[in-house]
Interface confidence: medium
């Protein structure tokens, strides 16, 4: 009686169980009563990552440099290529199918978390007593200079974007 189910790594065709092709190989012809399943290795830049009966291998992913991508891990006949972002860029989504430039923190904002290959820069406004006077991917908010510590007086108050300006204390009259 012909089988209705097959063992692991087999498939049912024409009322008989044939062996699946191993990862890295594609199906050329099904087995018969007299012959084994015929498989062929995937070509260069192709892969199959499971035991399969596919007649075509899958193309390796293309890491398009103009989408900000580069190869993180080259594909093999059994694995796909893994892309990541160029330095200074981060993935636009979990899929990481394209990248965008890291966003610098503008003056008045400091870097709380530096950008990574998958996340953008996290900026926060400089609180009172701190400033940032430049656009930067890594600079934090700096504390205002303490004029008192230098035995000087404040000539101009600081802002979130500027440091205080210290000057010599005016003589008491």
């Amino acid at each position: 009686e012909p089988p209705t189910a097959c063992r692991e790594k087999q498939y049912l065709i024409n009322s008989q169980c044939c062996s699946l092709c191993q990862p890295g190989q594609k199906l050329v012809s099904d087995c018969t009563e007299f012959t084994e399943t015929e498989c062929l290795p995937c070509g260069e830049s192709e892969f199959l990552d499971t035991w399969n009966r596919e007649t075509h291998c899958h193309q390796h992913k293309y890491c398009d440099p103009n989408l900000g991508l580069r190869v993180q891990q080259k594909g093999t006949s059994e694995t796909d290529t893994i892309c990541t972002c160029e330095e200074g860029w981060h993935c636009t989504s979990e899929a990481c199918e394209s990248c965008v430039l890291h966003t610098p923190c503008i003056p008045g904002f400091g870097v709380m978390e530096m950008a990574t290959e998958t996340t953008d820069t996290v900026c926060h406004p400089c609180p009172v007593g701190f400033f940032s006077n430049q656009s930067s991917l890594f600079e934090k908010c700096y504390p205002w200079t303490s004029c008192e510590d230098k035995n000087l007086e404040v000539l101009q108050k600081g802002t979130s974007q500027t440091n205080v300006i210290c000057g010599l204390k005016s003589r008491m009259r």
Partner: antibody, heavy 117, light 106 residues
């Protein structure tokens, strides 16, 4: 709000060339990729190519190599597509579309191109 | 190139019905993105990374799938959903679109 404003409709003669513009506002054009897409007869969408607006690097659909040239002017936040040696097959609506989340997030309103003598 | 085949090409539905359209890829892709286009307007990003709804897209929409088989489902279709929906892949150049599924509301 992010907006892509494309140049107006064009009626051009066979054999001529033309340039479509796509001006970005509401976000910096650099650091995003600008795609160009062709839609014929209000139906199929065909990806023409893309330009990395930061580096100026381009990737084309082989089918449109020699037909379309993509450029960017960072100072005016404008991307351009020049279409060369136009024929009736090139009559279509052309869209610019910026990627932000991996998909094409921001689309221009489209530029209708009619090639006719 | 990767060919994306959408089916059905045209479908008709009544308000309140559940609707599913499919996008089949000729070779395995990691993610599919969906766009909605209404007559005379530009396409709009609708679902990205297979299952994430773009901002402003009603929760009645959902996307799923993997490998070569993907789908877009509308749980309870409304008149405003009448449009053509296109799938798209970023995996291999040329980055292709499907032929579209036109959804008509009775």
């Amino acid at each position: 709000e992010v907006q892509l404003q494309q140049s107006g409709p064009e009626l051009v003669k066979p054999g001529a060339s033309m340039k479509i513009s796509c001006k970005a506002s509401g976000y910096s054009i650099t650091g995003y990729t600008m795609n160009w897409v062709k839609q014929s007869h209000g139906k199929n969408l065909e990806w023409i190519g893309l330009i990395n607006t930061y580096t100026g690097g381009t990737t084309y659909n082989q089918k449109f190599k020699g037909k379309a040239t993509l450029t960017v002017d960072k100072s005016s936040s404008t991307a351009y597509m020049e279409l060369l040696s136009l024929t009736s097959e090139d009559s279509a609506v052309y869209y610019c579309a910026g990627t932000g989340t991996g998909a094409m997030d921001y689309w221009g309103q489209g530029t209708s191109v009619t090639v006719s003598s | 190139q990767i060919v994306l085949t959408q089916s059905p090409a045209i479908m008709s539905s009544s308000p309140g019905e559940k609707v599913t359209m499919t996008c089949s890829a000729s070779s395995s892709v990691s993610y599919i993105h969906w766009y909605q286009q209404k007559s005379g307007t530009s396409p709009k990003r609708w679902i990205y990374d297979t299952s994430k709804l773009a901002s402003g897209v009603p929760a009645r929409f959902s996307g799923s799938g993997s490998g070569t088989s993907y789908s877009l489902t509308i749980n309870s279709v409304e008149a405003e959903d009448a449009a053509t929906y296109y799938c798209q892949q970023w995996r291999t150049n040329p980055y292709t679109f499907g032929g579209g599924t036109k959804l008509e509301i009775k």
